[in-house]
């Protein structure tokens, strides 16, 4: 079952799947000036049996200059064509990740592929968030999102993360500031109670969080 939407957008954060569930599709997109080869695959598909998963189909790009058409490549399948980019980071697979049953690893790059990858995720997929460089992560909990099926509809859970500029000091309650030294926090340091005004802007994006962010500590 394909997830209807993209994972949640967290300002100043990118997300990444460490592994892709069987059924995931990756659009065969080419960079500017290139197009899919004639009769080439529209997408790669993560498929497998009980012991092994792999990507079916290969994406291939060729120079647009070889034909007099500059027709745009549309993401497929048809009903998914409005999907936004879901892979903003380098497609390199983290070296330490164990392979998971029923999951494919990051597909290797293909020649002249587009700079951003468009995935179509399936129910049960988990993605992980990181703040972009120059922004600090404030955690209420895990920086992850899972596509789940509820009452016949798919939805993504809300990552419990806010990315704030280095100079800003807003915090989630129950969260301590980053450690300045390996010696541990000073005994006098206490959790900062967040008020609504501190968080006016950030709360809008965190409004759908499944846990209240205005308690002084974990209940």
């Amino acid at each position: 079952e394909l997830c209807d939407d993209d994972p949640p957008e967290i300002p100043h954060a990118t997300f990444k799947a460490m592994a892709y569930k069987e059924g995931t599709m990756l659009n065969c997109e080419c960079k500017r000036g290139f197009r899919r080869i004639k009769s080439g695959s529209l997408y790669m598909l993560c498929t497998g049996n009980s012991s092994h998963s792999s990507w079916d189909n290969q994406c291939q790009c060729t120079s647009s200059a070889t034909r007099n058409t500059t027709k745009q490549v549309t993401p497929q399948p048809e009903e998914q064509k409005e999907r936004k980019t879901t892979e903003m980071q380098s497609p390199m697979q983290p070296v330490d990740q164990a392979s998971l049953p029923g999951h494919c690893r990051e597909p290797p790059p293909w020649e002249n592929e587009a700079t951003e990858r468009i995935y179509h995720f399936v129910v049960g997929q988990m993605v992980y968030y990181q703040c972009v460089q120059g922004y600090r992560a404030l955690h209420r909990g895990p920086a992850e999102s899972v596509c789940k099926m509820t009452h016949g509809k798919t939805r993504w859970t809300q990552p419990q993360l806010i990315c704030t500029g280095e100079m800003e000091t807003s915090q989630f309650p129950g969260e301590e500031k980053p450690q300045a030294s390996p010696e541990g926090r000073p005994e006098s340091e206490t959790s900062c109670l967040v008020t609504t005004t501190d968080f006016q802007i950030q709360t809008e994006m965190a409004a759908t969080m499944e846990t209240s962010i205005f308690t002084t500590e974990y209940q």
Epitope: K16, Q97, M126, Y129, A137, G141, A143, V146, G174, T211
Partner: antibody, heavy 119, light 106 residues
């Protein structure tokens, strides 16, 4: 290869403090959070706290007043410090890492270090 | 905090049987993780996000559930499955573990 290893004092006197070091290899602490979990003998698992990749921390509120987690990224070490130990703090203490970045599913665990609180 | 209640506390089964253990949450959670633990060893990752198997977990294991009720099922139980299984949530703070289900093989 991802590895985590706890090292602790073994025996701690009541009312004293506990310091445990978790030394990791195969990944960077700047990319992954480390969580601490303990298990009293013959009992279940209890989550203590986490230090995220960026250095911020969350604690179990029941232990927050006497618990501190810090790290040294360059040495690939995470430190757990707990004050005012009592006999019911006797447990196996584990450090663990999530599968993805600052995630929740603990895919990698240390072998644990047994801490006995006794006079 | 969300309390996870695992039942039964002890589950006895014969090889080849299908067994199911449940994990009930005191409030609704988004997804559940499961761990297997052998005596004297660290917990092992077993199932994540309700239904995804960890590396090395036999295909006879499966996970399902939603809301406040989740389960781990072993299709044809084997002697090597005799261990304690813990569920864990982090939909709400703090993350909590269930009390465990000890699986015994007759």
């Amino acid at each position: 290869q991802v590895q985590l290893k706890e090292s602790g004092p073994g025996l701690v006197a009541p009312s004293q403090s506990l310091s445990i070091t978790c030394t990791v290899s195969g990944f960077s602490l700047t990319s992954y959070g480390i969580q601490w979990v303990r298990q009293p003998p013959g009992k279940g698992l209890e989550w203590l706290g986490v230090i995220w990749a960026g250095g911020s921390t969350n604690y179990n509120s029941a232990l927050m007043s006497r618990l501190s987690i810090s790290k040294d990224n360059s040495k690939s070490q995470v430190f757990l410090k707990m004050n005012s130990l009592q006999t019911d703090d006797t447990a196996m203490y584990y450090c663990a890492r999530a599968y993805g970045y600052d995630g929740s599913w603990l895919a990698y665990w240390g072998q644990g270090t047994l801490v006995t609180v006794s006079s | 905090q969300i309390v996870l209640s695992q039942s039964p506390a002890i589950l006895s089964a014969s090889p080849g049987e299908k067994v199911t253990m449940t994990c009930r949450a005191s409030s609704s959670v988004s997804y559940m993780h499961w761990y297997q633990q052998k005596p004297g060893s660290s917990p092992k990752p077993w199932i994540f996000a309700t239904s995804n198997l960890a590396s090395g977990v036999p295909a006879r294991f499966s996970g399902s559930g939603s809301g406040t009720s989740y389960s781990l099922t072993i299709n044809r139980v084997e002697a090597e499955d005799a261990d304690t299984y813990y569920c864990q949530q982090w939909s709400s703070n703090p993350p909590t573990f269930g009390g465990g289900t000890k699986l015994e093989i007759k």
